[in-house]
Amino acid sequence: ILGGREAEAHARPYMASVQVNGEHLCGGVLVAEQWVLSAAHCLEDAADGKVQVLLGAHSLSQPEPSKRLYDVLRAVPHPDSRPDTIDHDLLLLQLSEKATLGPAVRPLPWQRVDRDVEPGTLCDVAGWGIVSHAGRRPDRLQHVLLPVLDRATCNRRTHHDGAITQRMMCAESNRRDSCKGDSGGPLVCGGVLEGVVTSGSRVCGNRKKPGIYTRVASYAAWIDSVLA
């Protein structure tokens, strides 16, 4: 997260760290007792490593009573996701068992109404991704409020040049932005999960390259079918 600040500890009980061999790789969001939603591209970086999900964390390194690492029973990337595109960049991870819920671990309601968020709406994005262009990684969860950007502006030739589909949304990226390591994390508007940070090699913090988020409402049928 660029241009943000440390999040209130354990105030985002839905927040997950998707880890490979014990190292944070991507963000994720608990959407059901046994399911975490993340980005499909995160699996590409996992290679053959052991994928696990950390819930109830604020600090990645320090012991915390609410922290627990879960093995992954099943990884379900969206069937249409591809390595060479950010389209359909969603991944559902089934935990080895139902998460133990409490004040620091709780699923987040996700948007089911397939309607664009109004431009200018301030949405919260959080993660353990890099906090500087130098690549400094935080130990504690960071967050930033970002205004939603209208799709027409985001699709300008000077911005993402038509790459943003109806199934994606954009947020401003003028110094404040999500970045490497935040992929798969939640974009929360009005207390509801609206988007998932797409994974890609996008430059961060540049206003001409807005943050791209996969709209969860556009994938409600797929999410429901996997969770069923």
Epitope: A7, P119, T121, L122
Partner: antibody, heavy 121, light 106 residues
């Protein structure tokens, strides 16, 4: 302690413009959005818009398009709102407000002292 | 935009009474905030994210609701509660307020 100190009352003529200020103290001015809210005489609260003092990114209620412009000066930790082409409908108390927490929700947890604008010939 | 309608506009209660005021949204929102305002003062945050009391708010206040219907309840009204209470949604731009409920103490 976060404080938002607003400029004093303004008596302005119809058709004129006015610029009111909101000086912030007790926190990093560039770290948080500054919002503006209008309270008209029927005590109706209307959100006008916000600005991110760090980068100038702003958003406005369409209702105030052509009426209000919000700006911020980082060097003085002060936010401004200019109201133009004033009419009696613009007579109101104007507040700056912000959220200075770090949770997933946001609300106006700090409000300015308010600036009364009276439009009269 | 989301329109918030508060009722009643004026509420009159005796000390010790239980009172409830409501806020209805024209379309569904996930959470609601409430503010208290007394004459000549700026609004104060009172209840945030539907049911959380802001700092310094007495425990006799509570908030609840979901979807399009939210409420603020005072279990036993006291004289100092006389004020106007506004609901506010933050789900969608433009952020809107209700018209307010003025609580008068008999």
């Amino acid at each position: 302690e976060v404080q938002l100190q607003q400029s004093g009352p303004e008596l302005v003529k119809p058709g004129a413009s006015v610029k009111i200020s909101c000086k912030a103290s007790g926190y990093s001015f560039t770290g948080y959005y500054m919002h503006w809210v209008k309270q008209s005489h029927g005590n109706i609260l209307d959100w006008i818009g916000y600005i991110d003092p760090d980068n100038g990114v702003s958003s406005k209620n369409q209702k105030f398009t052509g009426k209000a412009t919000v700006t911020a000066d980082k060097s003085s930790s002060t936010a401004y709102m200019e109201l133009r082409s004033l009419t009696s409908e613009d007579s109101a108390v104007y507040y700056c407000a912000g959220y200075y927490g770090s949770s997933w929700y946001w609300y106006f947890d700090v409000w300015g002292t308010g600036t009364t604008v009276t439009v009269s010939s | 935009q989301i329109v918030l309608s508060q009722s009643p506009a004026i509420l009159s209660a005796s000390p010790g009474e239980k009172v409830t005021m409501t806020c209805r949204a024209s379309s569904s929102v996930s959470y609601m905030h409430w503010y208290q305002q007394k004459p000549g003062s700026s609004p104060k945050p009172w209840i945030y994210a539907t049911s959380n009391l802001a700092s310094g708010v007495p425990a006799r206040f509570s908030g609840s609701g979901s979807g399009t219907s939210y409420s603020l309840t005072i279990s036993r009204v006291e004289a100092e509660d006389a004020a106007t209470y506004y609901c506010q949604q933050w789900s969608s731009n433009p952020y809107t307020f209700g018209g307010g409920t003025k609580l008068e103490i008999k």
